[in-house]
């Protein structure tokens, strides 16, 4: 039960996180005009990864896309790449994790296969979250650097336009969305990896040596430890399982009252 809960929660947390990463990537408010020096401006600027916008006090908003690739700063391109990689990995991770969910039965898929898929999706979520956090952090660092640059002729960090009057930009809402979303995806990935450990059956099954006596059967492990004693007629070919530590989920797979772990 605990494994299913951990896996399910990991999936949901990752799903929310990836949705947040997608939202952050699409948002226009990666950087917003700093109003500290000019709180009475009638024109407000904000910028995203894909376009820059100007909102006039009268209510009109005009957005212009960055229609150049080569003219954009390398850092912006890097941030875009990190966010897209994060989204792609996250989306694949979600797809894989859907089939890995313990509560979903697909044909005769074994627990070991589900465990591997859970681990794969978990790792993908972790990398996806790290990509998002890295992308947002690189952008934030770019903003901080530009904020303190005193030169008038500087990149605004977006369109590479030369400014005649320095407009300073500060952290936009998308940065915080990105950080939180990346963190959630990371946590979801870790949860999936933890769930994977509970799903995976250990491969160290001992071969039991059975000694048959008339009337009853006593099976011994090589170490001489008495593993199981069975009474009654159904004692032929009794098999001893040593699957290591098991959760409640696995116990249900072995219903016989004579099978002790």
């Amino acid at each position: 039960m605990a494994v299913t809960a951990c896996q399910g929660l990991g999936f949901v947390v990752s799903l929310i996180g990836i949705a947040g990463i997608i939202a952050a990537t699409c948002m226009d408010q990666w950087s917003t005009q700093d109003l500290y020096n000019n709180p009475v401006t009638a024109v407000f600027n904000y910028q995203g990864l894909w376009r820059s916008c100007v909102r006039e006090s009268s209510g009109f908003t005009e957005c212009r896309g960055y229609f150049t690739l080569l003219g954009l700063p390398a850092m912006l391109q890097a941030v875009r790449a990190l966010m897209i990689v994060g989204i792609v990995l996250g989306a694949i991770g979600l797809l894989v994790s859907i089939f890995a969910l313990k509560c979903i039965r697909i044909g005769s898929m074994e627990d070991s296969a589900k465990a591997n898929m859970t681990l794969t999706s978990g790792i993908m979520f972790i990398v996806s979250g790290l990509c998002a956090i890295a992308g947002v952090s690189v952008f934030a660092n770019m903003l901080v650097t530009n904020f303190w640059m005193s030169t008038a002729n500087m990149y605004t960090g977006m369109g590479g336009m030369v400014q005649t009057v320095q407009t300073r930009y500060t952290f936009g809402a998308a940065l915080f969305v990105g950080w939180v979303a990346g963190g959630l995806t990371l946590i979801g990935g870790v949860m999936m990896c933890i769930a994977c450990r509970g799903l995976a059956p250990e491969e160290t099954n001992y071969k039991a040596v059975s000694y048959h006596a008339s009337g009853h059967s006593v099976a011994y492990k090589p170490g001489g430890f008495k593993a199981s004693t069975g009474f009654g007629s159904n004692t032929k070919n009794k098999k001893i399982y040593d699957g290591g530590a098991r959760t409640e989920d696995e116990v249900q797979s072995y219903p016989s009252k004579h099978d002790y772990v």
Epitope: Q33, N38, V40, T41, A42, V43, N45, Y46, Q47, S52, C53, V54, E56, S57, S58, G59, F60, E62, R64, T156, M161, Q163, T164, V165, Q166, T167
Partner: antibody, heavy 117, light 113 residues
């Protein structure tokens, strides 16, 4: 079409409060801002303040302590209140809609307010 | 506050001739975000409210004759009437639409010579 019409008393006594109303039609009050501008006889234009579609206001720094601009969306009306008036506040008062570029694209005909005892 | 200074105070031009007036702001009106100058020109005829001519320093309002044109950037702006008509006799005002308070210039009175 877009229309703005100022109304209010033409004569106000010194130290009293000047109250004017701008009734508008042809546009959404929540989508545009409305500015108040005045023009003393024979002089230039002076911007008083503005109320934006979201209800926020900005006032001229020299008048900020005396002026209040508000909106009544149910009546499609904007109001201007200017307290403690003096003879220097005698002017034609205009209301105008703020459009693209924050420019005032539609103006009312204006109403003359005289401050005199 | 941004101070808007218009020159000349008064201008006399013959019909059909070019009329040019200037407006200077104490601070730049250029917005780096969209590379637009938030300067507006108005025309006011006697006994009438002002009429919007040009916004963003050079964009003509719809219905305004194309003989009116605006130019300039940053702090220096110009309104040009390419061929003066009798109905262009008026006072012309420039306004800062970039920073509050949205101050007006003192105006340029245009007359026929």
């Amino acid at each position: 079409q877009v229309q703005l019409q100022e109304s209010g008393p033409g004569l106000v006594k010194p130290s009293e409060t000047l109250s004017l109303t701008c009734t508008v039609s042809g546009f959404s009050l929540t989508s545009y801002g409305v500015s108040w501008i005045r023009q003393p006889p024979g002089k230039g234009l002076e911007w008083i303040g503005v109320i934006w579609g979201d209800g926020s206001t900005n006032y001229h720094s020299t008048l900020i302590s005396r002026v209040t601009i508000s909106v009544d969306t149910s009546k499609n009306q904007f109001s201007l209140k200017l307290s403690s008036v003096t003879a220097a506040d005698t002017a034609v008062y205009y209301c105008a809609r703020a459009g693209r570029g924050n420019a005032l694209d539609y103006w009312g005909q204006g109403t003359l307010v005289t401050v005199s005892s | 506050d941004i101070v808007m200074t218009q020159s000349p105070d008064s201008l006399a031009v013959s019909l059909g001739e070019r009329a040019t007036m200037s407006c200077k702001s104490s601070q730049s009106l250029l917005n780096s975000g969209n590379q637009k100058n938030y300067l507006t020109w108005y025309q006011q005829k006697p006994g009438q409210p002002p009429k919007l001519l040009i916004y963003w320093a050079s964009t003509r309002e719809s219905g305004v004759p194309d003989r009116f044109s605006g130019s300039g950037s940053g702090t220096d702006f110009t309104l040009t009437i390419s061929s003066l008509q009798a109905e262009d006799v008026a006072v012309y005002y420039c306004q800062n639409d970039y920073s509050f308070p949205l101050t007006f210039g003192g105006g340029t009175k245009l007359e026929i010579k």
